[in-house]
């Protein structure tokens, strides 16, 4: 199935030109998305190109600037926030990464009544998180590891802890297995829906070993990097929730929610907190053996100031064949009642599916059901439910927005989006204004991404909001490659794959072949999205075809495929893999003397056991910030997939599926090994390893380090890195330069 | 009816101890942050003390940091002060009160605590 | 710490008169966190106002309470006989806590 009809007409070929990799890496083919900031039902904001904040209306066709770019760069911002009762917006500038999410930055607070900021009761610098309340112009912030809050942003903080303390104690953020492996945010606290009161998580890393590393830098002598990092086995961070009422917090203090003693008996997560109600909280909460979790809702009990979480509101989500789960537990979606909620979780036949709970888990009514899955609820109304699926036309790369009308009985199912744009459009995610009034459509491809603002009744289309014309004009005299999603059926398993073809394919001619690898617990590598990346680039300008392969532990395709690979990280992912080149030989386009295999992080460990097989299927392959060994991972990621690495649970296959275990079959490939040093996610120490066990059994093989990079390899390192990575493949597939 | 009522006063040498106790009914004592607040003869009010909900959030003024533990025992409905190292500026009328960081809204009665040699 | 100035130390009234104490901090105070208390001699102080401007259970609507920054105001409508006592005012914005050092209404 050819999604990208190429455009070359023999009259126009000699205008074409190819991808060339400095198109990849000055980024001439991005594209732009538009996600509406929205502020009511029918209002939201947007940051024009000019760098102005502008506020539209939706229903009068009205906009006005709320805020112009001279006092966005009087401070230097590159962010803001309004808040709800739109008498102030806070600036963000001297943004500073962290980690993934995380991140700290200069917050200032703009008075739009008066056309000033505010003076007196500055915030403090850094901040590591801000946010305002969901109603008026409280402010909660995180400073140094404790969280303050101020009643109105001109007022004094109000101090709620005070035991936070650099790489030990964390209140309102998360430290760094929680931030990367738990929550995947930034913040660890949660507004009530009106304000009253404010959750936050506090965790205690005092028992956590620390990852050190050296951060060369400029000066002398190298800093070091101490990060707390449970790695598989190693003691974990210890979670408490706090609740303090944001009215008087100076009276009661903070609260701690009870943990359902289930849970609370062992090692256990805080995985997430939803507000209910004001006075209604749900927590949800996983054993640290990832396949039991348990939510919780808990009620605010006036007359003793407490909270209060009865056994009968605990609901029990466990797996018997795999963790609980697709990558997170899924978080609930709450109807009106304010009791019952709508979830996505694994039905009878093991297809991740929405489920109704009204009283208890064996009680849920199932409202979704068949061979594919729901993927994520983004809003419950009184009469609508919205989803989106990967059920129409079966492709399991495919993600459609859907609506259930829960209003009627018996419940109908609309396909909001399949007949959209059919061609262009297959890959969607949605963001709704406040009661489904109104919502932004975002199509990822497989065409040039398109947004749109849409009807929240009627479902009709009200304007574009960005179509992505330069980007169309751009690519009018670029000779693309060809795309094709297409599956193979081997031994009851289905393998779907993308192959990425050169612009003039011809099949009966024999190519080099690419295969770039994920393959990650729960990941998908094969979708409908449209990408000009350093791939297209190898097909277009040098003839290589690429395949992505989708095999066992990957998402969206049922249990059976998801949890194949339950303690048993390493074999069947790298089983697929070299399945599916069997078969792309079979097909008789591929010479079978260039093969080659890379990927990046997960992708590195499975292109690295690959080449490692003893196949012979493989010249060469590369490997980007592989793990190595579990034994060195995150204890969260690591143990949901693999259980614990001791003699009575899991060491003997963590052992076995090390890279380092297989260093003798490296010989006969040749291996390009690549890490950044400051990678605080996939330490260097998994590349260290890989290189000793390599020179230890005399094997040759060619290696990068990236100086004070970390996993992304951002910045002049990707160009760097590209460049090697390409002048690697050419030369094992003997292209000219 | 909210009740506190104090005990544990007395005459004591300086560098000596006292501990403080404080029964608490007529509410959840267990949901709500308590608190030490003295009073020296003739003079104001100075807080000494205050202990969270959950145990281990306890903090202190600078005068006695070091010196006075603050605790709480839930399931006996008292909250307790230790005081070690005892000076003569101590000497003051303890009360116990119900509130964290203020309003206090509940104070028991008071107890004495002279430190004179 | 904050330091809470109250003034005047001592207010000499008669029954039925307008009370007006003042309590000034010495940095700014969120009025969620101001205070105020009446003591009686003998006796433990007792919560008149929080917010500074809600009255505490119980409390006769003759007292009240205003103010916000570093300038508060508790106010006595119409002093009653048992109104003659000590007043202190009190901030819970930060650890410590602190009380200014009471203005005493006297009978004149």
């Known amino acids: 199935i050819v999604l990208r009809p190429s455009r070359v007409h023999n009259s126009e070929e000699n205008t074409m030109r190819a991808l060339t990799l400095k198109d990849i890496l000055n980024g001439t083919f991005s594209y732009k998305t538009f996600f509406p900031n929205w502020i009511s039902g029918q209002e939201y904001l947007h940051q024009s190109a000019d760098n102005n904040i502008v506020l539209y209306n939706i229903e009068t066709g009205q906009s006005y600037t709320i805020l112009s770019n001279r006092t966005m760069k009087s401070v230097n911002a590159s962010n803001y926030g309004l808040s709800p009762d739109r008498q102030f917006v806070y600036l963000e500038s001297d943004y500073s990464k962290l980690w993934r999410y995380s991140y700290t930055a200069t917050y200032y607070i703009y008075d739009l009544s008066n056309g000033e900021f505010v003076r007196g009761n500055e915030l403090p610098r850094p901040i590591q998180y801000l946010c305002w309340s969901p109603v008026g112009s409280k402010l909660a912030y995180v400073y140094q590891n404790n969280i303050y809050l101020k009643q109105r942003p001109g007022d004094p903080p109000f101090q709620i802890t005070f035991n936070g303390r650099e790489n030990k104690i964390f209140n309102g953020i998360p430290d760094w297995v929680y931030e990367e492996e738990m929550l995947a945010t930034k913040y660890a606290l949660w507004w009530s829906p009106n304000g009253k009161f404010l959750a936050y998580a506090e965790f205690n890393d005092t028992d956590i070993p620390v990852i050190a590393y050296s951060y060369y830098g400029d000066e002398q002598y190298p800093r070091t990097i101490n990060i707390p990092y449970p790695k598989a086995g190693a003691k974990n961070p210890v979670v408490r929730i706090f609740i303090i009422d944001t009215t008087y917090p100076a009276y009661v203090g903070p609260q701690e929610v009870p943990v359902p003693a289930m849970i609370a008996s062992s090692d256990y997560y805080f995985s997430w907190l939803t507000w209910v109600t004001d006075e209604r909280v749900c927590l949800q909460w996983l054993k640290r053996v990832q396949n039991v979790s348990v939510l919780s809702i808990c009620d605010f009990r006036e007359d003793w100031q407490t909270w209060d979480c009865p056994k009968t509101q605990e609901h029990i989500e466990e797996s018997r064949t795999g963790w609980a789960g697709g990558f997170f537990v899924s978080t609930p979606v709450f109807s009106y009642d304010a009791i019952s909620y709508y979830k996505i979780f694994s039905d009878k036949d093991g297809y991740k599916h929405i489920h109704y709970i009204k009283d208890t888990v064996e009680n849920a009514i199932q409202i979704t059901s068949g061979k594919w899955e729901a993927i994520n609820i983004f809003r419950v109304t009184q009469d609508s439910l919205f989803y989106s699926s990967n059920e129409f036309e079966e492709y399991p790369g495919r993600r459609n927005i859907y609506r259930i009308s829960i209003g009627s009985y018996p419940p109908s199912k609309k396909c909001v989006t399949c007949h959209l744009r059919k061609e262009r459009c297959q890959y969607y995610t949605a963001s709704f204004s406040d009661y489904a009034k109104y919502y932004a459509l975002v199509c990822y491809g497989p065409g040039i991404p398109i947004s749109t603002l849409h009807d929240g009744r009627t479902d009709q289309e009200i304007k574009i909001l960005e179509e992505n014309k330069e980007l169309e004009n751009a690519l009018k005299n670029i000779q693309l490659p060809k795309e094709e999603i297409k599956k193979l059926e081997v031994d009851e398993i289905t393998l779907w794959y993308k192959m990425i073809l050169p612009p003039q394919f011809d099949r009966s001619k024999k190519y080099p072949l690419l295969i770039q690898v994920y393959g990650g617990p729960c990941s998908q590598s094969v979708r409908s999205v449209f990408a000009v990346n350093w791939i297209s680039y190898l097909a277009s300008k040098e003839g290589m075809v690429i395949a992505l392969v989708d095999g066992r532990g990957t998402a969206f395709q049922g249990d059976k495929l998801l949890y194949a690979v339950y303690r048993k990280l390493g074999v069947y992912e790298v089983e697929d893999q070299i399945t599916a080149v069997r078969k792309f030989i079979e097909m008789g386009f591929i010479d079978e003397k260039r093969i080659a295999i890379w990927g990046w992080s997960y992708g590195g460990y499975v292109s690295s056991l690959a080449l490692a097989s003893g196949t012979g299927l493989f010249k060469c392959g590369i490997a980007v910030a592989p793990v190595s060994s579990w034994e060195y991972y995150a204890s969260v990621y690591t143990e949901r997939f693999m259980g614990l690495p001791t003699k009575d649970d899991n060491l003997e296959h963590y052992k076995n599926s090390t890279v380092m275990a297989r260093a003798e079959y490296f010989r006969n490939v040749d291996y390009l090994l690549i890490h950044g040093t400051a990678d605080d996610n996939v330490h260097f120490q998994n590349s260290a390893q890989i290189a000793k066990a390599l020179v230890n059994a005399q094997v040759d093989f060619q290696a990068m380090w990236y100086s004070d990079q970390n996993h992304g390899l951002s910045g002049l390192s990707t160009n760097h890195l590209y460049t090697h990575m390409t002048h690697f493949l050419k030369q094992c597939f003997s292209l000219s330069d | 009816e909210v009740q506190l009522l104090e005990s544990g006063g007395g005459l004591v040498q300086p560098g000596g101890s006292l501990r403080l106790s404080c029964a608490a009914s007529?509410?959840?004592?267990?949901?709500?942050?308590m608190s030490w607040v003295r009073q020296t003869p003739g003079k104001g009010l100075e807080w000494v003390s205050a202990?969270?909900?959950?145990?281990?959030?306890?903090y202190y003024a600078d005068s006695v940091k070091g010196r006075f533990t603050i605790s709480r025992d839930n399931s006996k409905n008292t909250l307790y002060l230790q005081m070690n190292s005892l000076r003569a500026e101590d000497t003051a009328v303890y009360y116990c009160?119900?509130?964290?960081?203020?309003?206090?809204?509940?104070w028991g009665q008071g107890t004495l605590v002279t430190v004179s040699s | 710490e904050i330091v809470l100035t109250q003034s005047p130390g001592t207010l000499s009234l008669s029954p039925g008169e307008r009370a007006t104490l003042s309590c000034r901090a010495s940095?700014?105070?969120?009025?969620?966190?101001l205070a105020w208390y009446q003591q009686k001699p003998g006796q433990a102080p007792r919560l008149l106002i929080y917010?500074?401007?809600s009255r505490a259970t119980g409390i006769p609507d003759r007292f009240s309470g205003s103010g916000s920054g570093t300038d508060f105001t508790l106010t006595i409508s119409r002093l009653e006989p048992e109104d003659f006592a000590v007043y202190y005012c009190?901030?819970?914005?930060?650890?410590?806590?602190?009380f200014g050092q009471g203005t005493k209404v006297e009978i004149k």
């Open positions: 009160a119900k509130g964290w960081l203020g309003p206090f809204d509940y």
């Open positions: 007529g509410f959840t004592f267990s949901s709500y942050a």
């Open positions: 202990i969270g909900v959950s145990t281990g959030s306890t």
């Open positions: 940095q700014s105070v969120s009025s969620s966190y």
């Open positions: 917010g500074a401007s």
């Open positions: 009190q901030q819970g914005q930060l650890i410590p806590p602190t």
